[in-house]
């Protein structure tokens, strides 16, 4: 069954980074509007983005209720100007999305180096802990709160004067690395969930931060650069 002059949505795609989750689809509507429903395996479908002319729907509020659940969404097509009719039994055309498990599938956002601090031949590099829209007891959780030890960071660092990179790993948000005295270093970090075996295992690299610029502080040289 279907509704006159409406076409079913297609190419339903989940776009999700740090649990901010948008469902996108095609086609751009001509004389039709869409309503989205989302459910866990319970089949308790919840309607969102009622009669929208957009081809995306923010489902973050629903998926953050339990990021380890698996969700399915479906997009219904209605004629433009559609008004909900209690007498109508005709089912509008719809399409199902792929299944989506936020904990396993959300992309890791680009991390940011919060600060670095040199003390002698040691440098402490701190990665900024990103806030997510996942809540527990009315408090927003950070990426580390959600993933715990499933999330690690890889630090790439090199002397400003050379291209040879070294790496370090941590399952916290801090690195303590050995450096050569009197040398300036550059740093970049990447978020990784080692247990994932898919393309979304790693984030993109953070912007590069170098010693002698505005990010850290060096007790070695007497220059103090406080992070914002």
């Amino acid at each position: 069954s279907g509704t006159t002059n409406t076409v079913a949505a297609y190419n339903l795609t989940w776009k999700s980074t740090n649990f901010k989750t948008i469902l996108e689809w095609e086609p751009k509507p001509i004389n039709q509007v869409y309503t989205v429903q989302i459910s866990t395996k319970s089949g308790d479908w919840k309607s969102k983005c009622f009669y929208t002319a957009d081809t995306e729907c923010d489902l973050t509020d629903e998926i953050v209720k339990d990021v380890k659940q698996t969700y399915l969404a479906r997009v219904f097509s209605y004629p433009a100007g559609h008004v909900e009719s209690t007498g109508s039994t005709e089912e509008p055309p719809y399409e199902n999305s792929p299944e989506f498990t936020p904990y396993l599938e959300t992309n890791l956002g680009q991390p940011t180096i919060q600060s670095f601090e040199q003390v002698g031949t040691k440098v402490n590099v701190t990665v900024q802990d990103e806030w997510t829209l996942v809540r527990r007891n009315d408090t927003f959780l950070s990426l580390r709160d959600v993933f715990g030890k499933d999330l690690i960071y890889t630090l790439y660092y090199w002397k400003s004067s050379s291209s040879g990179k070294k790496t370090a790993k941590t399952n916290t948000n801090e690195f303590l690395i050995d450096v050569d005295k009197g040398e300036n270093y550059c740093f970049s970090v990447q978020a990784v969930i080692p247990s994932r075996r898919t393309a979304n295992r790693k984030s993109t690299d953070s912007p590069v931060e170098c010693m002698g610029h505005e990010k850290g502080e060096s007790r070695e040289t007497g220059h103090h650069h406080h992070h914002h």
């Epitope: 866990t40 395996k41 319970s42 089949g43 308790d44 479908w45 199902n96």
Partner: antibody, heavy 118, light 106 residues
């Protein structure tokens, strides 16, 4: 181990009523939609009804609409099918099944036999 | 309602044979199709969902393919335990089953 066990089948006269039960174990019952599927003797499978995990959404095949009522008690991990105004063509083995999203059936019970005859 | 038509209704085959069962939908159902196996006196068992996803614990000799209106269930090398009746089921719009395909010993 995930298990579903139907009960309540039997012989009933046309026009009579019967209530089937399905006891679930081994999974979080309220997290899954559930369904009833039947199979008449020597015939294929026919979907009868489905219900969401909360019990808030119910669906029926046209052949049973208005006569059958699906329900669930999540505190007892039990699914029900109340069958009224039974007809000879309702004679079948009735299976309860775990149904993710209410879409397909990934675990089935062994079935209970309902015979409608005078 | 969406009608599902299976063919053949009966299939005679020998152990080791490659067996293919076809299921056609009366309108496009994308990939929203499941396959079940049923033995006499037993409950059905899920083999495949979403047209080609193998259910956990199901032997890899079973595979599903197709989208839109035409689907196939393939058993790459028929085993003695595979003689049974197979059903397709669409879940694009409510639920309907195909009429079944009985795989019997040749």
């Amino acid at each position: 181990e995930v298990q579903l066990l139907e009960s309540g089948g039997g012989l009933v006269q046309p026009g009579g009523s019967l209530r089937l039960s399905c006891a679930a174990s081994g999974f979080t019952f309220s997290s899954y939609a559930m369904a009833w599927v039947r199979q008449a003797p020597g015939k294929g499978l026919e979907w009868v009804s489905a219900i969401s995990g909360s019990g808030g959404l119910t669906y029926y095949a046209d052949s049973v609409k208005g006569r059958f009522t699906i329900s669930r008690d999540n505190s007892k991990n039990t699914l029900y099918l109340q069958m009224n105004s039974l007809r000879a063509e309702d004679t079948a083995v009735y299976y309860c099944a775990k149904a993710p999203y209410g879409y397909y059936m990934d675990v089935w019970g062994k079935g209970t036999t309902v015979t409608v005859s005078s | 309602d969406i009608q599902m038509t299976q063919s053949p209704s009966t299939l005679s085959a020998s152990v080791g044979d490659r067996v293919t069962i076809t299921c056609r939908a009366s309108q496009s159902i994308s990939s929203w199709l499941a396959w079940y196996q049923q033995k006499p006196g037993k409950a059905p068992k899920l083999l495949i969902y979403k047209a080609s996803s193998l259910e956990s614990g199901v032997p890899s000799r079973f595979s599903g393919s197709g989208s839109g209106t035409e689907f196939t269930l393939t058993i790459s090398s028929l085993q003695p335990d595979d003689f049974a009746t197979y059903y397709c089921q669409q879940y694009k719009s409510y639920i309907t089953f195909g009429g079944g395909t009985k795989v019997e010993i040749k």
